[in-house]
Amino acid sequence: PEPPTACREKQYLINSQCCSLCQPGQKLVSDCTEFTETECLPCGESEFLDTWNRETHCHQHKYCDPNLGLRVQQKGTSETDTICTCEEGWHCTSEACESCVLHRSCSPGFGVKQIATGVSDTICEPCPVGFFSNVSSAFEKCHPWTSCETKDLVVQQAGTNKTDVVCGPQDRLRA
């Protein structure tokens, strides 16, 4: 019969014949021959291969280095890599999460729009009119100015994006 020019799914062409690929989690030991099947063996304890393959070596699982602020989010298997994330209060510097940096704080005049996660930094927003933030924080949102009216008081000092209004007693009308 004519040697194949293309092979079916889960196969590869070598020496004019179709050999079975190794399944995810296994590596190639030897190609098939006319008389034998492809020989594959499972990856070792700290290794993985995540695709149908003909790799002779498995990949090492990623190491989540605590010195870089990393910890294991999901332990790797023979078919998947380890997923790292950052310790509390830190976030990844890249999508690959190879190192971590401290979450940024929002300065006075700015509030937290979105709290940081292990993979994204704090998102700050300027406090709009009617709101303020007088602290540097990674958690605090902008607070609304105090409503003097509801307390039967009057504004003695206007609020800013960094300070609350100051309320005071209403001036008594003199007889």
Epitope: K10, S20, C22, Q23, P24, G25, Q26, V29, T36, E37, T38, E39, C40, L41, P42, W52, T77, S78, E79
Partner: antibody, heavy 121, light 106 residues
Framework: QVQLVESGGGLVKPGGSLRLSCAAS????????MSWIRQAPGKGLEWVSY????????YYADSVKGRFTISRDNAKNSLYLQMNGLRAEDTAVYYC??????????????WGQGTLVTVSS | SYELTQPPSVSVSPGQTASITCSGE??????ICWYQQKPGQSPVLVIY???KRPSGIPERFSGSNSGITATLTISGTQAMDEADYYC?????????FGGGTKLTVL
């Protein structure tokens, strides 16, 4: 005709030990990966252990890890299973089986007739 | 630990097609083997690497595997096909068997 013959089964008390043997004939034993599989009475198949051609790669089921040891002697065309710390739940027919010479991609294409291990006080 | 799930029993009339399923997480990412075991006998490999038949196994036995389900199909089922059938796969560094399916030929 390719043949695998198990021996060494029998009645043993809990905590006891047994050594099963599997004699291979009519094929080049050293060319094949080998496994032990067991089947409790009236139950399904359960894989026990696996050994590569040269014996340098070995895997065990969690249920037997630390208690059972698989080995082979290619010069004697023999596969062994040393079973220590036996428990009632180890009671089963133990089969030795030959892999299709494809490591972890083939199937078990030749099985012995099995040897019964009974663990009871 | 990884699990393969099979229906406990399947019935078929002689000459009809029997389908026995085996399901498991990411099963299409693994090679599946099928074994036939008759009462009092040792298992016999009928399909390996999803669809391949060892020599001596009749053409009426075929296999497929995709997604989370592998299927053993016996076309033109005969009385002699009545047996228990087990699927098997490698997961990580362990071999896993399904619980077995009893095929009854009515």
């Amino acid at each position: 005709q390719v043949q695998l013959v198990e021996s060494g089964g029998g009645l043993v008390k809990p905590g006891g030990s047994l050594r099963l043997s599997c004699a291979a004939s009519e094929f080049t034993f050293s060319d094949y990966y080998m496994s032990w599989i067991r089947q409790a009475p009236g139950k399904g198949l359960e894989w026990v252990s696996y050994i590569s051609r040269s014996g340098d790669t070995i895997y065990y089921a969690d249920s037997v890890k630390g208690r059972f040891t698989i080995s082979r002697d290619n010069a004697k065309n023999s596969l062994y299973l040393q079973m220590n710390g036996l428990r009632a739940e180890d009671t089963a027919v133990y089969y030795c089986a030959r892999d299709l010479a494809a490591g972890a991609t083939g199937g078990l294409d030749c099985w012995g007739q099995g040897t019964l291990v009974t663990v009871s006080s | 630990s990884y699990e393969l799930t099979q229906p406990p029993s399947v019935s078929v009339s002689p000459g009809q097609t029997a389908s026995i399923t085996c399901s498991g997480e990411r099963l299409g990412n693994k090679y599946i083997c099928w074994y036939q075991q008759k009462p009092g006998q040792s298992p016999v490999l009928v399909i390996y690497q999803d669809f391949k038949r060892p020599s001596g196994i009749p053409e009426r036995f075929s296999g497929s595997n995709s997604g989370i389900t592998a299927t053993l199909t016996i076309s033109g089922t005969q009385a002699m096909d009545e047996a228990d059938y087990y699927c098997q796969a490698w997961d990580s560094r362990t071999v896993v068997f399904g619980g077995g399916t009893k095929l009854t030929v009515l």
